[in-house]
């Protein structure tokens, strides 16, 4: 229950992807405001976009404080113009999200490759670390520095005049494969998660192809 | 609980076609890769074929590269696999199969299997 | 396309026996090698992944060892429903290959 002229928000959904995290609700706000609050499990609320008629609030910079932690948000209503007033209980309407765990949810932002190189029949492709706005010691962390093992590439290749993909893996930025002398190929790489149960998966990077200006070929 | 569950093989004559189905429940084909792989009478194991459905990738052993199509309906949690061109050698039981898609584990769950006989 | 060359093709073995399978690959594969049972009739069933890895659920009888490009499937003490076909596989590369099989039987 609450007050007639404030309806409670609805669709609380957690967008997020290497971590950078958006709450996101419903309706759009008709002579209402809304504020958000986060917290972990076991810890106390804040309070965040204050009185605000958007119906997105960006809560990166509480979640990236400890991405293993589980965080629970919820969305206040209050009538604009009038936010000290109350619901008929005594309290603001608010509703809560679904319980959010950044580590295991995150979506992987789409790959990029940064370079490749042929030398003779060996091609080593490298993947871009993306940095994510994880932070330790005052420095923005990695992909890699977040996930550790955890995070592994899938890497496909084929050859231009060829359509099946064959598949490298590796948990490092790295994947170093063998290719028939001659032939072009294209590549696309995936990140995945395998231990998750879902969002394993990233889009695919941008396909990549050899004569292109990203690669470098050496003939030995 | 993971399962994988093929259907739609039996008897075609040489020449002819068949599409078998693998139908998943316990998760979501999308988030991880399906591969086929057929075990004649009485003999070894043979790796067919992949897809990773959410990108619809393929990659088809030689002996059935442009007679077999893999493909997949996310919507269903459906792989399938289109047979053209069939051969007797071909008769095989045909094995759907979850690829776990970690450096270490591989084909972690399979399906019971679906006989496909090409026989005149 | 690497190949798996499994030995011995059958073996005759009793209950409580040591039983050790090897297969070969003709390249380099890492340790990404797998081993699978399989029983008349059913599906394979995996036992040992990346070489070396008792999979879950799998009896700690079963193991699984590399050196080099040869992987070697043991069971320690063999027991009555031990008695199947066994299969190695690389999935280093694309496409991934399996060894021709171990048939054990009783002896």
């Known amino acids: 229950s609450g007050t007639t002229n404030t309806v409670a928000a609805y669709n609380l959904t957690w967008k997020s992807t290497n971590f950078k995290t958006i709450l996101e609700w419903e309706p759009k706000p008709v002579n209402q405001v809304y504020t958000v609050q986060i917290s972990t499990k076991s810890g106390d609320w804040k309070s965040k976009c204050f009185y605000t008629t958007d119906t997105e609030c960006d809560l990166t910079d509480e979640i990236v404080k400890d991405v293993k932690q589980t965080y629970l948000a919820r969305v206040f209503s209050y009538p604009a113009g009038n936010v000290e007033s109350t619901g008929s209980a005594g309290e603001p309407l608010y509703e809560n999200s679904p319980e959010f765990t950044p580590y295991l949810e995150t979506n992987l932002g789409q790959p990029t490759i940064q370079s490749f190189e042929q030398v003779g029949t060996k091609v080593n492709v490298t993947v871009e670390d993306e940095r994510t706005l994880v932070r330790r010691n005052n420095t923005f962390l990695s992909l890699r520095d977040v996930f550790g093992k955890d995070l592994i590439y899938t890497l496909y290749y084929w050859k231009s005049s060829s359509s099946g993909k064959k598949t490298a893996k590796t948990n490092t930025n790295e994947f170093l494969i063998d290719v028939d002398k001659g032939e072009n190929y294209c590549f696309s790489v995936q990140a995945v998660i395998p231990s998750r149960t879902v969002n394993r998966k990233s889009t695919d990077s941008p396909v990549e192809c050899m004569g292109q200006e990203k690669g470098e070929f050496r003939e030995i | 609980e993971v399962q994988l569950v093929e259907s739609g093989g039996g008897l075609v004559q040489p020449g002819g076609s068949l599409r078998l189905s693998c139908a998943a429940s316990g998760f979501t084909i999308s988030d991880y890769w399906i591969h086929w792989v057929r075990q004649a009478p009485g003999k070894g194991l043979e790796w067919v074929g992949y897809?990773?459905?959410?990108?619809?990738?393929?990659y088809y052993a030689d002996s059935v590269k442009g007679r077999f199509t893999i493909s997949a309906d996310t919507s269903k949690n459906t792989a399938y696999l289109q047979m053209n061109s069939l051969r007797a050698e071909d008769t095989a039981v045909y094995y759907c199969a979850r690829d776990y898609g970690s450096l270490q584990v591989f084909i972690d769950h399979w399906g019971q299997g679906t006989l496909v006989t090409v026989s005149s | 396309d690497i190949q798996m060359t499994q030995s011995p093709s059958s073996l005759s073995a009793s209950v409580g026996d040591r039983v050790t399978i090897t297969c070969r690959a003709s390249?380099?594969?890492?340790?990404?090698v797998a081993w699978y049972q399989q029983k008349p009739g059913k599906a394979p069933k995996l036992l040992i992944y990346s070489a070396s890895f008792l999979y879950s659920g799998v009896p700690s009888r079963f193991s699984g060892s590399r050196s080099g490009t040869d992987f070697t499937l043991t069971i320690s003490s063999l027991q009555p429903e031990d008695f199947a076909t066994y299969y190695c596989?690389?999935?280093?590369?694309?496409?991934?290959?399996f060894g021709q099989g171990t048939k054990v039987e009783i002896k």
């Open positions: 897809i990773d459905p959410y990108n619809g990738y393929t």
């Open positions: 390249q380099d594969v890492n340790t990404a």
């Open positions: 596989q690389q999935h280093y590369t694309t496409p991934p290959t």
